[in-house]
Amino acid sequence: EEELQVIQPDKSVLVAAGETATLRCTATSLIPVGPIQWFRGAGPGRELIYNQKEGHFPRVTTVSDLTKRNNMDFSIRIGNITPADAGTYYCVKFRKGSPDDVEFKSGAGTELSVRAKPSAPVVSGPAARATPQHTVSFTCESHGFSPRDITLKWFKNGNELSDFQTNVDPVGESVSYSIHSTAKVVLTREDVHSQVICEVAHVTLQGDPLRGTANLSETIRVPPTLEVTQQPVRAENQVNVTCQVRKFYPQRLQLTWLENGNVSRTETASTVTENKDGTYNWMSWLLVNVSAHRDDVKLTCQVEHDGQPAVSKSHDLKVSAHPKEQGSNTAAENTGSNERNIY
């Protein structure tokens, strides 16, 4: 009679992570008597996957009933496959011996490849806010995918970005891979409502890329523009001066009025109005009693925005002449105006 052969008909098997892998194996003879064992890998370091004779292998089931006397099908199913299960599996026939069974013949091996989906991309931006015209970096990471081939794209508000660098690790063979990409984005004043999107496409995703997003509202700081104007006289000796704080983001803002360099009042922006682009406007006013001043008054609106150094705008209030009704842009009002930026 011809000597027993162990046949593994599949050179390779490909499954998705989470699926069940079927590893086929048949013997050509019932003789010699002895059990079958499945191993991952060859040589002394091989890992026992299934032993027909003894042991507990909760993830492994046999395709046929191995207790039947004439059974020659030793195929197994391995459930809930992960990338760590990848490798070459050998079906090995043992001959009954005393005290131990002796390895008789091995199959040619079946290479199990596992395809695993990438994790949802995580996008992170800079630790500190930046102002328009500055370039900021965003990173995108996704892990645990196999095979290595993967496509990553960056978008800002639906427009594809080109200034980015991507690495897939490790460089050599591995059961699974990770991708890391850094994109450079130039901020504009209109970016409060903008989104940066990292899109990852992989064969396991069935054509539905995974996306990670970052809102530029968490990255951008739009500094305010200030305008100090003198309003028409409200009473004989009172002048209303307003400070318009425009187009700022985020909302965190503190305003201080100074009269001739002395703090008159400090307030925090509360009832702001929101612009279409997501920035805010706010107005503060100061009622100045002209009769309390002998000389001209220098009024300064000083704004500290989002913990940044204060910016200020001043307005010279003439008290020598009788105050008359003035518009917000009269020559007299602008004469002594100046703007100081402190960085």
Epitope: A16, R115, P147, D149, T151, V203, Q206, G207, D208, P209
Partner: antibody, heavy 118, light 109 residues
Framework: EVQLLESGGGLVQPGGSLRLSCAAS????????MSWVRQAPGKGLEWVSI????????YNADSLKGRFTISRDNSKNTLFLQMNSLRAEDTAVYYC???????????WGQGALVTVSS | QAVVTQESALTTSPGETVTLTCRSS?????????ANWVQEKPDHLFTGLIG???NRTPGVPARFSGSLIGDKAALTITGAQTEDEAIYFC?????????FGGGTKLTVL
């Protein structure tokens, strides 16, 4: 057993429209990207379109210039191809095919013949 | 658009090993092109044999294998049988679309 069954083919005049269906059985449609591929008489295969597993993303052959639209109803396990402004050169057998892992045309239907002629 | 080129016809004998190739006009075929091989038998019967360069569809005989040879994708039939007589199409993926080759008519005499 995986089966794909196309229907809706027939004779249509140039400029007309036709909607092909592909009824899938033996698997859950939403777990797979699906494709339409056509074969003109005596010619080779030409890829037409892909619908992603969710149906949210589509990939189309540039040559069709937006005349064909792929869609799916995952609840009914059915894939569709809406063909508008048909031309004589669109005459072909249209096949739906399943994509395993998005990179593997593993199962094909038997095809639906579309003839565009006046 | 890329052009995918295959041998128009090949002839082999039963038991012989035959290799069909698939070339891309854009350069070397890589694993990112996810080479597919599809068999057409009479009466428009199509079967997906190989996907993703080298993965055999369940139920397809082990004598069919896919690989990259040099700058081309290849389908090798080890020990061809008379029932393997058919037309074989390869398909390559280019970022957002597939392109099929013209097909190879394989005769097994």
């Amino acid at each position: 057993e995986v089966q794909l069954l196309e229907s809706g083919g027939g004779l249509v005049q140039p400029g007309g429209s036709l909607r092909l269906s592909c009824a899938a059985s033996g698997f859950t449609l939403s777990s797979y990207a699906m494709s339409w591929v056509r074969q003109a008489p005596g010619k080779g295969l030409e890829w037409v379109s892909i619908s992603s597993g969710s149906g949210a993303n589509t990939y189309n052959a540039d040559s069709l210039k937006g005349r064909f639209t792929i869609s799916r109803d995952n609840s009914k396990n059915t894939l569709f191809l809406q063909m508008n402004s048909l031309r004589a050169e669109d005459t072909a057998v249209y096949y739906c095919a399943r994509l395993r892992f998005f990179d593997w045309f593993d199962y094909w239907g038997q095809g639906a013949l579309v003839t565009v002629s006046s | 658009q890329a052009v995918v080129t295959q041998e128009s016809a090949l002839t082999t004998s039963p038991g012989e090993t035959v290799t069909l190739t698939c070339r891309s006009s854009t350069g070397a075929v890589t694993t990112s092109n996810y080479a597919n091989w599809v068999q057409e038998k009479p009466d428009h019967l199509f079967t997906g044999l190989i996907g993703g360069t080298n993965n055999r569809t369940p139920g397809v005989p082990a004598r069919f294998s896919g690989s990259l040879i040099g700058d081309k994708a290849a389908l090798t039939i080890t020990g061809a049988q008379t029932e393997d007589e058919a037309i074989y199409f390869c398909a390559l993926w280019y970022s957002n679309h597939w392109v099929f080759g013209g097909g190879t008519k394989l005769t097994v005499l």
